[in-house]
């Protein structure tokens, strides 16, 4: 038994036929010693007398509000809730399994940007006697603050004969660092109480993995002379992180008729305009995705082809900041080749994702995961890799990136990746390894020496451990190279001489 909040207690029960239940001792919160009686809920039947009441809790009939009285006066209440465990698994009767992205997904969360603000939602078919409370933190062993509002009913839907209710909550990380590479996941805990049943649900994620931008805004069409082509332009959504030269998006532009089965024109671009073929009854749709990290695509923003009227040109991706401030104190006193670094880091992003696409069936955040990922270098808040830090002095950040590149390059060449089980012959790990080396050499030409971090002894003994470690390292590398790519893109746009 444990206290959920003042005067509310949760009794944890193994739930099987003829289970003995739990013995619970309730104590009346009063200085009085005698003449005390106990009742349950609205019943006037006296269950016992004295300052304490011992009960055997086996089923929901034993739960409820226990009240102690003296001479017609209520002294205190204790509400007992039951938390069922069947076959070693806690019950999940209150919320509906959303089955996306995998089974047993009860909470789903999304973030529109990297500000540390996110929304979580869940579904239930229960309409009454239902309360939720939400807590969140970053990390679990030394948690950092995340503030969540109250859960509210956000939608009602009819699904066949049933009504389905969607609840949502907004949370904000107290000290968010949008440019940093997250090393500890956000933990979200939802307590759900339906009548006398208690359940808890948890979700663990990095903001980067739940990013879903808002759709692009201000779609405009401009027909091109003597052609069936039109130029479509758009802008970054207002809710996306700035500056856009650092937090860049990539876009998918699609022209299609009303039916999904109809033929289409489709093109991908990093710019905020594209030229497509527009048929009479079709519409043009554009959606956005983080350019350097493969999180969710936005919903589509659409405009009918027939409305090719207004012709404002495509607006640029804004927020590039001031012109070419000189880089200080890079080894040898020279600036890195920002544009070359940008191209190679973007290639690294692509390779890191093709080496390890999102593994839907494998939950890589298992026990001890905080320790494993702490062994690899992360680009942290104080490393100067944010746009302001880069403008002030990019050397700190470049040094940090260089350390990370060397670290991952050594890891990819180590026994973890060369040992059994052998990598598939078509694995891009070899290319990834070479590209990491290439970028580190661009950053630090021969003869200059920055300190490099020691490679920890991550030597797994079993092939399955090696496999798991590969997944974890590649997932971590994806996050690292995404931040590096943002740094170089921003540098190329704003710091290049």
């Amino acid at each position: 038994i444990w206290e959920l909040k003042k005067d509310v207690y949760v009794v944890e029960l193994d739930w099987y036929p003829d289970a003995p239940g739990e013995m619970v001792v309730l104590t009346c919160d009063t200085p009085e010693e005698d003449g005390i009686t106990w009742t349950l809920d609205q019943s006037s039947e006296v269950l016992g007398s004295g300052k304490t009441l011992t009960i055997q809790v086996k089923e929901f009939g034993d739960a409820g509000q226990y009240t102690c009285h003296k001479g017609g006066e209520v002294l205190s209440h204790s509400l007992l809730l039951l938390h069922k465990k069947e076959d070693g698994i806690w019950s999940t009767d209150i919320l509906k399994d959303q089955k996306e992205p995998k089974n047993k997904t009860f909470l789903r969360c999304e973030a529109k940007n990297y500000s540390g603000r996110f929304t979580c939602w869940w579904l239930t078919t229960i309409s009454t006697d239902l309360t939720f409370s939400v807590k969140s933190s970053r990390g679990s062993s030394d948690p950092q603050g995340v503030t969540c509002g109250a859960a509210t009913l956000s939608a009602e839907r009819v699904r066949g004969d049933n009504k389905e209710y969607e609840y949502s909550v907004e949370c904000q990380e107290d000290s968010a660092c949008p440019a940093a590479e997250e090393s500890l996941p956000i933990e979200v805990m939802v307590d759900a109480v339906h009548k006398l049943k208690y359940e808890n649900y948890t979700s663990s994620f990095f903001i980067r993995d739940i990013i879903k931008p808002d759709p692009p805004k201000n779609l405009q069409l401009k027909p091109l002379k003597n052609s069936r082509q039109v130029e479509v332009s758009w802008e970054y959504p207002d809710t996306w992180s700035t500056p856009h030269s650092y937090f860049s998006l990539t876009f998918c532009v699609q022209v299609q008729g009303k039916s999904k089965r109809e033929k289409k024109d489709r093109v991908f671009t990093d710019k905020t305009s594209a030229t497509v073929i527009c048929a009479k009854n079709a519409s043009i749709s554009v959606r956005a995705q983080d350019r350097y990290y493969s999180s969710s695509w936005s919903e589509w923003a659409s405009v009918p082809c027939s409305g090719s009227g207004s012709s404002r040109g495509g607006s640029g991706s804004g927020g590039s900041g001031g012109g070419g401030s000189k880089l200080r104190a890079v080894p040898g006193g020279s600036s890195p080749a920002w544009t070359q670094c940008q191209q190679l880091s973007q290639k690294l992003c692509t390779l890191a994702w093709s080496a390890h696409p999102l593994v839907g069936h494998m939950d890589l955040r298992e026990e001890g995961d905080e320790e494993t990922t702490n062994d690899v270098p992360h680009i942290q808040c104080g490393d100067g890799c944010d746009p302001q830090g880069l403008r002030d002095n990019s050397q700190f950040c470049l040094q940090r990136i260089h350390q990370g590149l060397i670290f991952y390059e050594k890891l990819l060449g180590s026994d973890i990746f060369t040992g059994e089980p052998s990598l598939l012959p078509d694995s891009p790990v070899g290319q990834l390894h070479a590209s990491l080396l290439g970028l580190s050499q661009l950053l630090q030409p021969e003869g200059h020496h920055w300190e490099t971090q020691q490679i920890p002894s991550l030597s797994p003994s079993q092939p399955w451990q090696r496999l798991l470690l590969r997944f974890k390292i590649l997932r971590s590398l994806q996050a690292f190279v995404a931040v590096a790519a943002r740094v170089f893109a921003h540098g190329a746009a704003t710091l290049s001489p």
Partner: antibody, heavy 118, light 107 residues
Amino acid sequence: QVQLVQSGAEVKKPGASVKVSCKASGYTFTDYYLHWVRQAPGQGLEWMGWIDPENGDTEYAPKFQGRVTMTTDTSTSTAYMELRSLRSDDTAVYYCNANKELRYFDVWGQGTMVTVSS
Amino acid sequence: EIVMTQSPATLSVSPGERATLSCRASQSISINLHWYQQKPGQAPRLLIYFASQSISGIPARFSGSGSGTEFTLTISSLQSEDFAVYYCQQSNSFPLTFGGGTKVEIK
């Protein structure tokens, strides 16, 4: 399954015209874009243009503009490509191909060899 | 127009070995890049679309990667039926253009 069958080989004199046909089957003709791509002997591939059989819309590569005409006959599910003012360097295998997506080529015809020689 | 350059022009590989084919665009084309295989006397066939998307029915040993201006087609372990000419094609803008091709021949 989707299939494209092209007309037979042609030999033409310089200055003449050629009209190659491409008969589609295994799908609703108007549901796919149709492209024409050619390949000179021992050379690479060269895109000529596309047609949308649903409405007759076309887009030609600038190199062929004014010299090529692409048409379709929906009643027979057949596409045609006519190339005029033939020169010896038009000697090539001409392929038709079809796809629901406009910008790449999924299903190819077997090709039609057109030889331009005096 | 966008110029596509493939390298090498000819690649000599032993059966069972890995082959890596490169394609470079004259300007950034995002992931609007497709790969085809052509055997002598046959029409080309689509292998990979949008840089890395695989086609059903195409063996898993064919994989594509890249974005921007540099792209790679990898054949992990060459089989006898893979000796052919491979073309890349950009779909970023019209006119659609192909690379000059890479001939993969038996070493």
